[in-house]
């Protein structure tokens, strides 16, 4: 049996002001590194305690960073991108892709565009429950017949 | 478990070599910003040569055209050739690792690392 991974992506846009030591995070990723196949996106690899983004306490390890600044990540070298936190400013607003984890079912792969990353099993026990109180109902209203 | 061992090291001469390498186990270097720091008697740690996630090498201007840091990924491991070595340089040498790359500084700055060797002695005299 396969194992499945089934992904609920939400996206967030996140303030942070830079601290004394900076932001306080490390990144992955790049046209000339990529993190995930088939992906050349920038991603969160680390959260330094005690830095601004931990403090925040948002941001998390895996996040993709879309943006900076309304400046789009895509299609850039890992370290233009670094280069171009080093220099956003004091302010620092960053849109941001979460990736949660909401189950590990048995088989079958759900791809990243489909929305529907819902477990089974969410669908299924409200199902049973009904269908349980509906023939209890019905076995009552029988015997009173 | 994520681990770095040293090795090397020692005794040398004034204006000799020695080669120092650090293994990493429980991780693949590939992604990993990876420093060489060094610490003399009463002195603060200060940074010496790293090389970034990228493969970016850096060093601090006092071991430029001395020192050489290489990596290689298919063995995790990491060297720092030491050439034309002098007294000062006399000091317990580590090696650190860190996932990515910092969003503030570069590997030269030890305050950004998160995984530390227990240090090997180059003592030059």
């Known amino acids: 049996m396969n194992g499945r991974v089934d992904y609920l992506v939400t996206e967030e846009e996140i303030n942070l002001t830079r601290g004394p030591s900076g932001l306080g995070f490390n990144i992955v990723g790049g046209t000339d590194q990529q993190y995930v196949s088939n992906d050349s996106g920038i991603y969160v690899s680390r959260i330094k305690e005690n830095g601004a983004a931990a403090l925040d306490g948002r941001l998390q390890e895996g996040d993709k960073i879309l943006s900076v600044n309304g400046q789009d990540l895509k299609n850039l070298l890992h370290q233009d991108a670094v280069d171009l936190f080093r220099n956003a400013g004091y302010a620092v607003s960053l849109r941001v892709q979460h990736r949660l984890q909401v189950q590990n079912g048995p088989i079958g792969h759900r791809g990243e565009g489909d929305p529907s990353g819902i477990p089974i099993f969410m669908v299924l026990v409200p199902v049973f429950a009904l269908t349980m109180v509906a023939a209890w109902a019905f076995m009552r209203y029988r015997q009173q017949l | 478990h994520v681990q770095l061992v040293e090795s090397g090291g020692g005794l040398v001469q004034p204006g000799g070599s020695v080669r120092v390498s650090c293994v990493s186990s429980?991780?693949?270097?590939?992604?990993?910003?990876i420093g060489w720091f060094r610490q003399a008697p009463g002195k603060e740690r200060e940074g010496v040569s790293c090389?970034?996630?990228?493969?970016?090498?850096y060093y601090v201007d006092s071991v430029k055209g001395r020192f050489t840091i290489s990596r290689d990924n298919a063995k995790n491991t990491v060297y720092l050739q030491m050439n034309s070595l002098k007294p000062e340089d006399t000091a317990v040498y580590y090696c650190?690792?860190?996932?990515?790359?910092?969003?503030?500084?570069?590997?030269?700055?030890?305050?950004?690392?998160?995984y530390w060797d227990q240090g090997t002695q180059v003592t030059v005299s």
């Open positions: 429980g991780f693949i270097l590939d992604y990993y910003a």
């Open positions: 090389i970034d996630s990228v493969g970016r090498a």
């Open positions: 650190a690792a860190d996932f990515g790359s910092s969003v503030d500084s570069t590997c030269l700055n030890n305050q950004q690392y998160d």
